[in-house]
């Protein structure tokens, strides 16, 4: 039961995380105008991965897409790539994990197959989360660098009467959404990997084969001491192919109309 709960929770956490990564990638507020020097600005600038926007006091908001591909900074392209890779891996991971869920039964899929799928999706979620965290962190680093560069520029060339106010940008809401979402996806992936360990049979049990030696009646079971005594083995998660009793998690049913969602 704990394995099912861990797997289910891992799936849900990853699902929320990936939804967050998608939301962050689509959001326009990756960087927002720094209002430290002018908290009551009549024109507010903010930028995303795909377009930059201007919101006026009048309520009018205008957004312009980055229609050039080659003219964009390499770092921005890298961030876009990381976020897209994160989304793609996360989406594939979700698809795989749906079939790997213990509570969903598809045909006569064995636990070993489900364990492998759970591990695969878990790794995908971990990489997806890392991609998102890396993407957001690269963008944040870019912002910090540009912020201090523009701050330095602000205080140079002020000799004349005319001041040119340079717009500085700071962290936008999308960065925080991205960090949290990446973290959740990562946590979800770790949970799936943990669940996989519980799902996987530690070793395969075969039906006992009796070898009759002269004068001795010894039942030989492959697997050595552990298999014959049962000590240290996870009996709950082991398939026993001799028609013995099965635990609730082990019961295999034939597909019904409720099995395919």
């Amino acid at each position: 039961m704990a394995v099912t709960a861990c797997q289910g929770l891992g799936f849900v956490v990853s699902l929320i995380g990936i939804a967050g990564i998608i939301a962050a990638t689509c959001m326009d507020q990756w960087s927002t105008q720094d209002l430290y020097n002018n908290p009551v600005t009549a024109v507010f600038n903010y930028q995303g991965l795909w377009r930059s926007c201007v919101r006026e006091s009048s309520g009018f908001t205008e957004c312009r897409g980055y229609f050039t591909l080659l003219g964009l900074p390499a770092m921005l392209q890298a961030v876009r790539a990381l976020m897209i890779v994160g989304i793609v891996l996360g989406a594939i991971g979700l698809l795989v994990s749906i079939f790997a869920l213990k509570c969903i039964r598809i045909g006569s899929m064995e636990d070993s197959a489900k364990a492998n799928m759970t591990l695969t999706s878990g790794i995908m979620f971990i990489v997806s989360g890392l991609c998102a965290i890396a993407g957001v962190s690269v963008f944040a680093n870019m912002l910090v660098t540009n912020f201090w560069m523009s701050t330095a520029n602000m205080y140079t060339g002020m000799g004349g009467m005319v001041q040119t106010v340079q717009t500085r940008y700071t962290f936008g809401a999308a960065l925080f959404v991205g960090w949290v979402a990446g973290g959740l996806t990562l946590i979800g992936g770790v949970m799936m990997c943990i669940a996989c360990r519980g799902l996987a049979p530690e070793e395969t049990n075969y039906k006992a084969v009796s070898y009759h030696a002269s004068g001795h009646s010894v039942a030989y079971k492959p697997g050595g001491f552990k298999a014959s005594t049962g000590f240290g083995s996870n009996t709950k998660n082991k398939k026993i192919y001799d028609g013995g009793a099965r635990t609730e998690d082990e019961v295999q049913s034939y597909p019904s109309k409720h099995d395919y969602v």
């Epitope: 002018n38 009549a42 006091s57 009048s58 001041q163 340079q166």
Partner: antibody, heavy 118, light 113 residues
Framework: DVKLVESGGGLVKPGGSLKLSCAAS????????MSWVRQTPEKRLEWVAT????????YYPDSVKGRFTISRDNAKNTLYLQMSSLKSEDTAMYYC???????????WGQGTSVAVSS | DIVMTQSPSSLTVTTGEKVTMSCKSS????????????LSWYQQIPGQPPKLLFY???TRESGVPDRFTGSGSGTDFTLTISNVQAEDLAVYYC?????????FGAGTKLELR
């Protein structure tokens, strides 16, 4: 047809109070940022206050901050300017305006006159 | 605060003439986010409230005759009337729309010779 009609002006003693109203019609009042602008007897234009669409943000110049309060009633399509601790330099024609693209004021009312004198 | 300086304070013209008036700001009104200049021009005919002519420095408001042209960027702006008509005799104001407090120029009065 867009119409802005100001009212509530008059003669008031220094230190006194006055509340100006602006009745808006011909447009969706709640969807626009509104401002008050005054014109001094010397014909200088001075921005007095701005209230953002939702009414959650208000802006004032230092000259009126703490004395004037802009507010709006979207249900009544009315803009208000509560003026207190009035000074002689507040004597002016007060206009109600609508903000559009570029933070420009595309429509102005006919104005209401405020005279602060002892 | 951004200071708006208009020149000349008055202009005497004859109808049909081309007129140019200037507006300078103490700070740049160019917004880097959309590369637009947050300056507007108004016309005030005596006894009437001001009327919007241009926003974003050069975008003509609907109903404004095309003999009026707004130009300039950063801190220097110009309003040009190519063929002055009698109905153009008014006071012209420029306004900073970029940052609070919104500030107006002192105006340029257009008079008939």
């Amino acid at each position: 047809d867009v119409k802005l009609v100001e009212s509530g002006g008059g003669l008031v003693k220094p230190g006194g109070s006055l509340k100006l109203s602006c009745a808006a019609s011909g447009f969706t009042f709640s969807s626009y940022t509104m401002s008050w602008v005054r014109q001094t007897p010397e014909k200088r234009l001075e921005w007095v206050a701005t209230i953002i669409i939702g009414g959650s943000y208000t802006y004032y110049p230092d000259s009126v901050k703490g004395r004037f309060t802009i507010s709006r009633d979207n249900a009544k399509n009315t803009l208000y300017l509560q003026m207190s601790s009035l000074k002689s330099e507040d004597t002016a024609m007060y206009y109600c305006t609508r903000l559009v693209k570029g933070n420009a004021m595309d429509y102005w009312g006919q104005g209401t006159s405020v005279a602060v004198s002892s | 605060d951004i200071v708006m300086t208009q020149s000349p304070s008055s202009l005497t013209v004859t109808t049909g003439e081309k007129v140019t008036m200037s507006c300078k700001s103490s700070q740049s009104l160019l917004n880097s986010g959309n590369q637009k200049n947050y300056l507007s021009w108004y016309q005030q005919i005596p006894g009437q409230p001001p009327k919007l002519l241009f926003y974003w420095a050069s975008t003509r408001e609907s109903g404004v005759p095309d003999r009026f042209t707004g130009s300039g960027s950063g801190t220097d702006f110009t309003l040009t009337i190519s063929n002055v008509q009698a109905e153009d005799l008014a006071v012209y104001y420029c306004q900073n729309d970029y940052s609070y407090p919104f500030t107006f120029g002192a105006g340029t009065k257009l008079e008939l010779r």
